[in-house]
Structure formats: structure tokens, C-alpha cells
């Protein structure tokens, strides 16, 4: 004969555990039903009556099967530098992530607690390491033969165009200016539509990104905005 199915609440066999989606109530000494996600225990079980569950109140949630007396409060509304990637519902917490152009300077279990604007490399400096969701941009000075004339969190140093006749030599923050109307094209890797090297200056490639020395951010410790690195601007 098949074993009889026990209905909650029931006393478990000695040494056995309660079934899936049940919990052992110490007071009643019975296996009782858990509440489903989006609910909480309004009345705990007794020897003769099962758990009474109720829906989570506005702006609260439970994500798991549970027997908590109150649902958890959803996190605050997302700030202006964030976007809500998951709404607060009865079954899930709100998740805020940083909007484009920002990165997470202080994470939390899910989403971000504190967003900061991505560093912008000023003219003469290019992006050595792009920003990610959780790390800032790393800037580096443009190497000889390359330049960046923008204040940007995405632009790298680009090779100077190489002229038949140079009108104004390039520097770290400005491209070379040619007198010739049709400069030859550069063969520099990654450089699109750039002039051919004909001057005595050697051909330059894009600078190799260097490892960042930016500190890693612990999500346990609040951290103020870091001072801008050399070549960055904080606007």
C-alpha cells in the first residue's frame, strides 16, 4: 500500500525532515506550510491549524518560500543617475543600475547603491581602459605620434595624420595639419582613413592600454568620489 500523504500540520517521523515548501515550527512541533513568494505568514501554525499567509503589503516583497511575519521593504526609488532595471513587486526587490555614462562606485547585493560619472579624459589624454558597469575609465597621456583633442570617456589616442608637407606638427592634443590637399594614408593599425607615412617620423600605432592603478571599490565600505586622475576632468 502507498504511504499515506500527510497534510499540514503534521508531526514528522523522528529523525525525518519536513517536505519541500514546509518548515518545522518549534512552538507547535509540527511540519507546517511555508508561504509562497509575494506572501508572508499572517498567522503561524498550531497543532491543529496550518500557517495563514497573506499578500505582501505595498512596497514590500518576499522572493522565496518563507514563514516570515512581515515582507521585506523594497529599496528606495532609483536616483536620477540610475535606471530601474527591475521594479519593486510583491515577489522581487527593486534593482537600480547606473545610467549610461556612469559606473557603480558602491555596489549592493543586487544593483548599485552609489553611481559616479565616468571619468572624462581631457585633450592630450586618451582612454587606456574603458569604463565598465563597476569600474571607472583609466586615462593615459597620448604617446608621441598620437593625439586626442576631445574631452571624452570613450575616445582613445589616435595616430597623427602623416603629411607630404607638414603645415603644423601634431602634438598630444592636436592632429598634424598638412599643406597638401591629398595626404597619403597611414597604415597604422586601427586607424581608419589616415594618411600614409612619408615623413621621417616612424609609424605609430595606438598606445597599448596600461594596467590600471585605480583602487578597487569594496561594497562594504562607503567611498567618496576619487580625485580625478592625471588627464581626467570631473565635469
Amino acid at each position: 500500500l502507498p504511504a499515506q500523504v500527510a497534510f499540514t500540520p503534521y508531526a514528522p517521523e523522528p529523525g525525518s525532515t519536513c517536505r519541500l515548501r514546509e518548515y518545522y515550527d518549534q512552538t507547535a512541533q509540527m511540519c507546517c506550510s511555508k508561504c509562497s513568494p509575494g506572501q508572508h505568514a499572517k498567522v503561524f501554525c498550531t497543532k491543529t491549524s496550518d500557517t495563514v499567509c497573506d499578500s505582501c503589503e505595498d512596497s514590500t516583497y518576499t522572493q522565496l518560500w518563507n514563514w516570515v511575519p512581515e515582507c521585506l521593504s523594497c529599496g528606495s526609488r532609483c536616483s536620477s543617475d540610475q535606471v530601474e532595471t527591475q521594479a519593486c513587486t510583491r515577489e522581487q526587490n527593486r534593482i537600480c543600475t547606473c545610467r549610461p555614462g556612469w559606473y557603480c562606485a558602491l555596489s549592493k547585493q543586487e544593483g548599485c547603491r552609489l553611481c559616479a560619472p565616468l571619468r572624462k579624459c581631457r585633450p592630450g589624454f586618451g582612454v587606456a581602459r574603458p569604463g565598465t558597469e563597476t569600474s571607472d575609465v583609466v586615462c593615459k597621456p597620448c604617446a608621441p605620434g598620437t593625439f586626442s583633442n576631445t574631452t571624452s570617456s570613450t575616445d582613445i589616442c589616435r595616430p597623427h595624420q602623416i603629411c607630404n608637407v607638414v603645415a603644423i606638427p601634431g602634438n598630444a592634443s592636436m592632429d598634424a595639419v598638412c599643406t597638401s590637399t591629398s595626404p597619403t594614408r597611414s597604415m597604422a593599425p586601427g586607424a581608419v582613413h589616415l594618411p600614409q607615412p612619408v615623413s621621417t617620423r616612424s609609424q605609430h600605432t595606438q598606445p597599448t592600454p596600461e594596467p590600471s592603478t585605480a583602487p578597487s571599490t569594496s561594497f562594504l565600505l562607503p567611498m567618496g568620489p576619487s580625485p580625478p586622475a592625471e588627464g581626467s576632468t570631473g565635469d
Epitope: S55, D58, S59, S73, C74, S76, R77, A87, C88, T89, R90, R94
Partner: antibody, heavy 120, light 108 residues
Framework: QVQLVQSGSELKKPGASVKVSCKAS????????MHWVRQAPGQGLEWMGR????????KHDPKFQDKAVLSSDTSVSTAYLQISSLKAEDTAVYYC?????????????WGQGTLVTVSS | DIQMTQSPSSLSASVGDRVTITCTAS???????LHWYQQKPGKAPKLLIY???NLPSGVPSRFSGSGSGTDFTLTISSLQAEDAATYYC?????????FGQGTKVEIK
């Protein structure tokens, strides 16, 4: 755009009942609450109760528990407030207002109000 | 019930003045659950500040809110003629949810 449009003014005799409607448009009725707030002439705002249109669950200020019945019909995106056993002191403007789930009860859109006058 | 007491009940100020309205709760209210509404004569209330200090889009930045626990403040940094209205605080921390009695702001 989001709109809450309420039914027109009502003149009722004491002891009668009245049903005020609030038609919602421009948003999904899911994951919102519809609240009813009353304002007697020259007085402040008084929260009466709230309904979750998706489930029909209601919550009242105990003061209005036996006075006000909240209901909703999601097929026509309309919430209703029925007030029974009207007295002169129920003369007020009745507002519906919505609060999205997760916004901690902030009522971000309000109906234009329905004046209910109770007079013999 | 949580009682919400606003002060002053009414005030008269000149255009450009800084105006402060306080709201005191009879027991602690989580800052997420404290909101302010503005109501002009003959009109429905309008959400002015949500969760103590956040402005909905379209609300001028001269309005600000602060506070925690039982004491909350609404500030108008530079009063404008169109700010003549009654202002209500509202707690959604414990049911029944309650409003303050209102503060009427008039322009001198």
C-alpha cells in the same frame, strides 16, 4: 497620458446612498492601488480606503469601514466608491488617486473630484 | 493611528521669501513613506515631494524636503506667486494612512 476621470456631482437626501466612479486610462491597472480621499468643505484631506484592482483586496480607515464600499471593474478600468446611509456630514468632495506598487504610497495622479452634497 | 501635525497652520510671506513648513508624526515614519502634496483652491491635490526628499518631474527645484523619524520639513527656497496653496504631509507607514491638517500659504 495618465488620467483619472470621476463621475459628476451628486445631490442626495439623508439616508440614501451614492456610488462614485473613477475611470482610469493611460496606464495598466496591474500593480497599482486606487485610493479614495475625501475633503469636507473648508477642511483637510482624509484617507478613506484603498483597493487593489487586480485582486479586489481592500483596506479601509476603520472610521469608514461600515460606511464605504470599494470595488473595481478591470474590464472597464473603473474603480467605485459606494457610500451608504448618507448624513449631512458626508457632504464633501471625494477624490480617487492612484499609487503604483513600490512607490511607498505616493499618490501621483488624482481624479478631478466628485462633489457629493447631502441635504434634505 | 499615526497623527501628523503640521505647523504653522497658515502663513503669509512675500515673493522671494524662504518658507519652511514642518510636519511632526506621533510615531516614527520611515522616510520612504512620507510624502507632500500641494492643493490649489478648487483643484485636486498634486504630488509635490515623494519619499521625504524626491521631486516628481515637473516640480520646480525651489521645493525641497528633508527629515527623518518623526520630524519632516518642506521648504520653498524662493516663494513665487503661483505657490499660493495648501500643503499637506502624508504618511503611508502604518494603516490607516493619514494626512497632516494642512498649511495654507498666502502671498503678502
Amino acid at each position: 497620458q495618465v488620467q483619472l476621470v470621476q463621475s459628476g456631482s451628486e445631490l442626495k437626501k439623508p439616508g440614501a446612498s451614492v456610488k462614485v466612479s473613477c475611470k482610469a486610462s493611460g496606464f495598466n491597472n496591474k500593480d497599482i492601488y486606487m485610493h479614495w480621499v475625501r475633503q469636507a468643505p473648508g477642511q483637510g484631506l482624509e484617507w478613506m480606503g484603498r483597493i487593489d484592482p487586480a485582486t479586489g483586496n481592500t483596506k479601509h480607515d476603520p472610521k469608514f469601514q461600515d460606511k464605504a464600499v470599494l470595488s473595481s471593474d478591470t474590464s472597464v478600468s473603473t474603480a467605485y466608491l459606494q457610500i451608504s446611509s448618507l448624513k449631512a456630514e458626508d457632504t464633501a468632495v471625494y477624490y480617487c488617486a492612484r499609487s503604483p506598487y513600490g512607490d511607498f504610497g505616493a499618490m501621483d495622479y488624482w481624479g478631478q473630484g466628485t462633489l457629493v452634497t447631502v441635504s434634505s | 493611528d499615526i497623527q501628523m501635525t503640521q505647523s504653522p497652520s497658515s502663513l503669509s510671506a512675500s515673493v522671494g521669501d524662504r518658507v519652511t513648513i514642518t510636519c511632526t508624526a506621533s510615531s516614527s515614519v520611515s522616510s520612504n513613506y512620507l510624502h507632500w502634496y500641494q492643493q490649489k483652491p478648487g483643484k485636486a491635490p498634486k504630488l509635490l515631494i515623494y519619499s521625504t526628499s524626491n521631486l516628481p518631474s515637473g516640480v520646480p527645484s525651489r521645493f525641497s524636503g528633508s527629515g527623518s523619524g518623526t520630524d519632516f520639513t518642506l521648504t520653498i527656497s524662493s516663494l513665487q506667486a503661483e505657490d499660493a496653496a495648501t500643503y499637506y504631509c502624508h504618511q503611508y507607514h502604518r494603516s490607516p494612512w493619514t494626512f497632516g491638517q494642512g498649511t495654507k500659504v498666502e502671498i503678502k
